[in-house]
């Protein structure tokens, strides 16, 4: 059974992931952002189901495409370079989902824009955090 300290650690990691995803969304989600039209041409794949930490495998698999899109963004919108930002997210995702269990991600048929993709994973983080508190 998870201890209160491990639950607290998980919660903090999820909050960190949530903040990173929100920062990316806020950085690009601007009607006046000239690069937004370019970013919206990229397709992202969404999980069929995302209710448990193991489903973060689906986010991990989309981090490389996410980095490619962020390379289009104006760097002033983010504190870190896309590569460093994605690297930080990857570390958190690996810790949260655990590397010892192999989970095959199932994707939905419908693809998503970067905005829809980020909103989906932000909702996921918020949902898991709410079950922990």
């Amino acid at each position: 059974a998870p201890t209160s300290s491990s639950t607290k650690k998980t919660q903090l990691q999820l909050e960190h992931l949530l903040l990173d995803l929100q920062m990316i969304l806020n950085g690009i989600n601007n009607y006046k952002n000239p690069k937004l039209t370019r970013m919206l041409t990229f397709k992202f794949y969404m999980p069929k189901k995302a209710t448990e930490l193991k489903h973060l495998q689906c986010l991990e698999e989309e981090l490389k495409p996410l980095e490619e899109v962020l390379n289009l963004a104006q760097s002033k919108n983010f504190h870190l370079r896309p590569r460093d930002l994605i690297s930080n997210i990857n570390v958190i995702v690996l810790e949260l989902k655990g590397s010892e269990t192999t989970f095959m991600c199932e994707y939905a048929d419908e693809t998503a824009t970067i905005v829809e993709f980020l909103n989906r994973w932000i909702t996921f983080c918020q949902s898991i955090i709410s079950t922990l508190t």
Epitope: Y31, L36, R38, T41, K43
Partner: antibody, heavy 126, light 108 residues
């Protein structure tokens, strides 16, 4: 309503220079990318390049890089396509088109180029 | 440079279904857009983001994408659908756009 009005038809000789225009109205000109598309007689559409009038960020198709210059004057809401030395092979219809981004709730949709000018016919002949 | 490949022509009888394909290496990660161009007119957007229809475009126009192939389908083709159709997408970097070669749809 949102409109792009292009300058009139041009007949030029090889080696001459030319600048055609595309005037936007009914929207914030500086907030949308404007692209240029070539259509040679009886042929398909070719993407030439694009400009963001807000900061003049410009991208060219590798096929047109160095062949034409795309610019904009935001004070008069006008985009331009120019040649320094025309060739007979530049004979074509040239369209300007605006890229459209729509905000719907917390989401954004990108419609590609969905507002088009009427086209400018350029004829280059000796 | 990046290319999108379309068949030069597609023929269909009125009321039948026409399918136009567009292939490109980047399409698994890039949305396709479709334009209709009637003779002597400027192009009109008929599909965006692979499968979404702008307002004012008839329901008989639909789009889909799978792997490196995007498809525009005209279900129950009508005489007024006779036109050239172009797919449009970006290269892998997202910086440069490209049109397919175009497909002439004839409704016989």
């Amino acid at each position: 309503q949102v409109q792009l009005v292009q300058s009139g038809a041009e007949v030029k000789k090889p080696g001459e220079s030319l600048k055609i225009s595309c005037k936007g109205s009914g929207y914030s000109f500086t907030s949308y990318w404007i692209g240029w598309v070539r259509q040679m007689p009886g042929k398909g559409l070719e993407w030439m390049g694009i400009i963001y009038p807000g900061d003049s960020d410009t991208r060219y198709s590798p096929s047109f890089q160095g062949q034409v210059t795309i610019s904009a004057d935001k004070s008069i809401s006008t985009a331009y396509l120019q040649w320094s030395s025309l060739k007979a092979s530049d004979t074509a219809m040239y369209y300007c088109a605006r890229e459209t981004l729509a905000a719907v709730g917390s989401n954004y949709y990108y419609y590609g180029m969905d507002v088009w000018g009427q086209g400018t016919t350029v004829t280059v002949s000796s | 440079s990046y290319e999108l490949t379309q068949p030069p022509s597609v023929s269909v009888s009125p009321g039948q279904t026409a399918r136009i394909t567009c292939s490109g290496d980047a399409l698994p990660r890039k949305y396709a857009y479709w334009y209709q161009q009637k003779s002597g007119q400027a192009p009109v957007l008929v599909i965006y983001e692979d499968s979404k229809r702008p307002s004012g475009i008839p329901e008989r126009f639909s789009g889909s994408s799978s792997g490196t192939m995007a498809t525009l389908t005209i279900s129950g083709a009508q005489v007024e659908d006779e036109a050239d159709y172009y797919c449009y997408s970006t290269d892998r970097s997202g910086n440069f756009w490209v049109f397919g070669g175009g497909t002439k749809v004839t409704v016989l």
